[in-house]
Amino acid sequence: EVEKTACPSGKKAREIDESLIFYKKWELEACVDAALLATQMDRVNAIPFTYEQLDVLKHKLDELYPQGYPESVIQHLGYLFLKMSPEDIRKWNVTSLETLKALLEVNKGHEMSPQVATLIDRFVKGRGQLDKDTLDTLTAFYPGYLCSLSPEELSSVPPSSIWAVRPQDLDTCDPRQLDVLYPKARLAFQNMNGSEYFVKIQSFLGGAPTEDLKALSQQNVSMDLATFMKLRTDAVLPLTVAEVQKLLGPHVEGLKAEERHRPVRDWILRQRQDDLDTLGLGLQGGIPNGYLVLDLSMQEALS
């Protein structure tokens, strides 16, 4: 807290300008009117205030707006945003995408801070859903943003927003998140033709069920091994050797390099060795000829 002291004669600030950088902390407190500061916030960024001076300016705004800053002030906070705590930000009501962009710009190039996370949370909750423009903005600043959301939060993403998602935005997503995003992507891209559809849906396939993979295998998509390895194990296991061969096309020979990695390893164990041999890749570990496979899980379900 800065002590309340009278402003020295002739030092009362008429506007926010460079002369203020020579003011001591107590002079800033005494000589700068909070209402003036609020209306001229856009000038603060152009002035090389010290961190201590910025603390004083923040204190003045806090006194003027104890219930939270209005958006007109928030939009022009600039580097003063870095002084805000998540508790401060929870009092705000940010509705403009321009305001959001302005504040994200301040933190650009850095990890997502607790302040930024709180700001985004407030903004998205205020909008009710993660619309395309917001998603575009957030992933531009933080490519990993989408994957930082819980499956519950992702459920509020409308299918139309999926068009804004780039492959790199999904790099750190786990299967639970892709389980939520995949049906939305399937819906979003449903009117595209085969090859174009595959290019768009490819990054989301970690959430695809078996029946969709079977359908893809009929479309000459030539899935690469990196994509195949990201598929859900439970979705891959029921695929036949013929279906996997069609799904991978010329990339099928890559199964050899990944034969000990899941889901390839688990899939091999489920196939008849005779069928695996037809691939000519030397894949071993399939079910020997003459053995009967009992699906015990199916038996339990029936009893």
Epitope: E253, K256, E258, H261
Partner: antibody, heavy 119, light 108 residues
Framework: EVQLQQSGPELVKPGASVKIPCKAS????????MDWVKQSRGKSLEWIGD????????IYNQKFEGRATLTVDKYSSTAYMELRGLTSEDTAVYFC????????????WGTGTTVTVSS | QLVLTQSPAIMSASPGEKVTLTCSAS???????LSWYLQKPGSSPKLWIY???NLASGVPARFSGSGSGTSYSLTISSMEAEDAASYFC?????????FGGGTKLEIK
């Protein structure tokens, strides 16, 4: 430019452990496997194992099974190899190497980390 | 494990000379699964040839690779000073992946 940056030399005591980082840049780490290779002084290369960064699934050369652990932090695009119970036989240069998933050759190699085990 | 034996262990060649390095496998390896790496002192290995005969990006055309089954080779049609290095063959046909002992090629 695709690069795999490894840490500087390590001097460790027998019985101790070492964890070597390999920072990937210029590509998406989850789209390729990351393998690790040992090279003892003046000797050939020895494959330790590999990890698929997307799901962290790792496989090992039986010789290193139980002593080596391969992990990945997707968020920082960094792969790690931890080797435990070190002996003088583990004195070597350790390389991380990128492997295009579905192939068995290493198209980009790390800078190498020299580990010296000595009391 | 599948053993790869390289010969000779060390050899020297004059500039312009044709050079052949060999790699012999203890059991059959599909040609898709054999590659070669070059390594210079103090540096990391570099992919040089993959799938027996495909040159990696940036490898001069004087290099070639051939072979099948248990016998593979790397050939330099006309030796140059910059080709002096150690060459390692590598197989990924069976686990664990293995490398040959290497051939150190020197310039005369």
């Amino acid at each position: 430019e695709v690069q795999l940056q490894q840490s500087g030399p390590e001097l460790v005591k027998p019985g101790a452990s070492v964890k070597i980082p390999c920072k990937a840049s210029g590509y998406t780490i989850t789209d390729y496997n990351m393998d690790w290779v040992k090279q003892s002084r003046g000797k050939s290369l020895e494959w330790i194992g590999d990890v698929f960064p997307y799901n962290g699934d790792s496989i090992y050369n039986q010789k290193f099974e139980g002593r080596a652990t391969l992990t990945v932090d997707k968020y920082s695009s960094t792969a790690y190899m931890e080797l435990r119970g070190l002996t003088s036989e583990d004195t070597a240069v350790y390389f991380c190497a990128r492997r295009k998933t579905g192939t068995g050759y290493f198209d980009v190699w790390g800078t190498g980390t020299t580990v010296t085990v000595s009391s | 494990q599948l053993v790869l034996t390289q010969s000779p262990a060390i050899m020297s060649a004059s500039p312009g000379e044709k050079v052949t390095l060999t790699c012999s496998a203890s059991s059959s390896v599909s040609s898709t699964y054999l590659s070669w790496y070059l390594q210079k002192p103090g540096s990391s290995p570099k992919l040089w040839i993959y799938s027996t005969s495909n040159l990696a990006s940036g490898v001069p055309a004087r290099f070639s690779g051939s072979g099948s089954g248990t016998s593979y080779s790397l050939t330099i049609s006309s030796m140059e000073a910059e080709d002096a290095a150690s060459y390692f063959c590598h197989q990924w046909s069976s686990y664990p992946y293995t490398f040959g002992g290497g051939t150190k090629l020197e310039i005369k």
